[in-house]
């Protein structure tokens, strides 16, 4: 993979694609500039993932000018929130998570675009997954590593994003028990960043922790093909 | 911009078929994640979906009209064509197309609509 | 199939008022929830996505919530360009319509 934007410097909203480990390249928003007197964040911007709208800290050698680089990494990917942050990126560039409340560092200032209420249920909860990035160390998650039920995990598409629900037991699907109800028939989430402390997902339940693998290319190959065999298909699920 | 048109007779008579097709632009449907849907509203009552397509010609139906509905695209000219078979007067609606991207976000642009009536 | 009930038809309300508008879904949609606007003149819009996220150019007026099978919609502060009917609409399996809930100015 080409390192050439190793040096780049981007503003705050700048349009971008994000690499994280174990992650394709993520349709994501610049949200914050790097705050130098900030140790663990120095040199680092704070961008906004489209799709998912969490919220990670990145330096500039993960980041992909959106416009340069859609042609190469904007193809549909099997991750839950991809399909959904491509059009974001391109039809709701400007859009908050519910509850978003910006850090203390050196946010964007942006024509004041109105955000909505937080919706309930979705505004209070912290992320699950927070720490610092791939090349600090291990990533710290909230919660403790499980393997959730993946089948399903093509099924992408609106109109087919839910489970045949006799399959699948609640029980099992959401050990953890927050937002019971609206997790359900979650299969994964599929961004699951270093969560700002104070930042807020507005989705139930986001955050899981990325793999910890080392050769994340090869990784997300062998992943997807492990989804492939084990997945039915996007487009089998017509009734319940 | 993105804008979608429907057109199609606005009179059938019972047990004929209807053709209706939406003619698009601001958008392609050889576009990986863009699909076309139909959705009805007979008068004063609610919306109903009919059917869907997706760019990779994936189709949707509405099971309960499924066997009278064929959903087609032709993607060079920005068409997508509802046909709708054995009509009867509790057919008579208005039919929009709508565009849909493949997750989660709805039906983000709709056409103005088409009033057909089904009557002898 | 998923059914979604809306059980008021229709609601009156004053400019300035904040009004909320309910939908239910036969079974747990896992927040696949989206609600349009439709005017008087037919044409029709969506409003919020996923339950809770505003689509581009909707005033910030307009929110939605919910989990499960309960949603809904709220508007802080109505005015009178909101004088509509409103229908939710699953996602999860296949899409589905409320029965619409129509807002009249008192």
């Known amino acids: 993979m080409s390192r050439s934007n190793r040096q780049k410097e981007y503003k705050c909203g700048d349009l971008v694609f994000a690499k994280m480990k174990g992650y394709p390249h993520w349709p994501a928003r610049i949200d914050e500039m790097p705050e130098a007197a900030v140790k663990s964040t120095a040199n680092k911007y704070q961008v906004f993932f489209f799709g998912t709208h969490e919220t990670a800290f990145l330096g500039p050698k993960d980041l992909f000018p959106y416009e340069e680089s859609k042609e190469k990494f904007g193809k549909p990917n099997k991750r839950k929130g991809f399909s959904e942050g491509l059009w974001e990126i391109e039809n709701n560039p400007t859009v908050k998570a519910s509850g978003y409340q910006s850090s203390q560092k050196k946010s964007c200032v942006e024509e004041p675009e109105p955000e909505p209420e937080a919706a309930e249920g979705d505004g209070d909860k912290k992320g699950n997954a927070e720490g610092s990035s791939d090349e600090e160390g291990k990533l710290v998650i909230d919660e403790p590593a499980k393997e959730k039920n993946e089948k399903g995990a093509l099924k992408r598409r609106a109109g087919d994003l839910l489970e045949d629900s006799p399959k699948r037991p609640k029980e099992a699907e959401n050990p953890e028990g927050e937002e019971k109800e609206a997790a359900t028939l979650e299969v994964e989430r599929p961004l699951p960043m270093e969560v700002e402390k104070n930042s807020t997902p507005s989705e139930p339940g986001s955050g899981r922790g990325p793999p910890q693998e080392e050769e994340e290319e090869e990784d997300e190959e062998e992943e997807a093909t492990k989804e492939d065999a084990e997945a039915p298909g996007i487009r089998d699920h017509e009734s319940l | 911009q993105i804008t979608l048109k429907e057109s199609g007779p606005t009179l059938v008579k019972p047990t004929q078929t209807l053709t209706l097709t939406c003619t698009f632009s601001g958008f392609s449907l050889s576009t990986s994640g863009i699909g076309v849907a139909w959705i009805r509203q007979p008068p004063g009552k609610a919306l109903e979906w009919l059917a869907t397509?997706?760019?990779?010609?994936?189709?949707r139906y509405n099971p309960s009209l499924k066997s009278r509905l064929t959903i087609t695209k032709d993607t060079s000219k920005n068409q997508v064509v509802l046909t709708m078979t054995n009509m009867d007067p509790v057919d008579t609606a208005t039919y929009y197309c709508a565009q849909i991207y493949d997750y989660a976000v709805g039906f983000a642009y709709w056409g103005q609509g088409t009033l057909v009536t089904v009557s002898s | 199939d998923i059914q979604m009930t809306q059980t008021t038809s229709s609601l009156s309300a004053s400019l300035g008022d904040r009004v909320t508008i309910s939908c239910r879904a036969s079974q747990d949609i896992s927040n696949y929830l989206n609600w349009y606007q439709q005017k008087p003149d037919g044409t029709v819009k969506l409003l919020i996505y996923y339950t809770s996220r505003l689509h581009s150019g909707v005033p910030s007026r307009f929110s939605g919530s919910g989990s499960g099978t309960d949603y809904s919609l709220t508007i802080s502060n109505l005015e009178p360009d909101d004088i509509a009917t409103y229908y939710c609409q699953q996602y999860g399996k296949l899409w589905t319509f409320g029965g619409g809930t129509k807002l009249e100015i008192k």
């Open positions: 397509i997706w760019w990779d010609d994936d189709n």
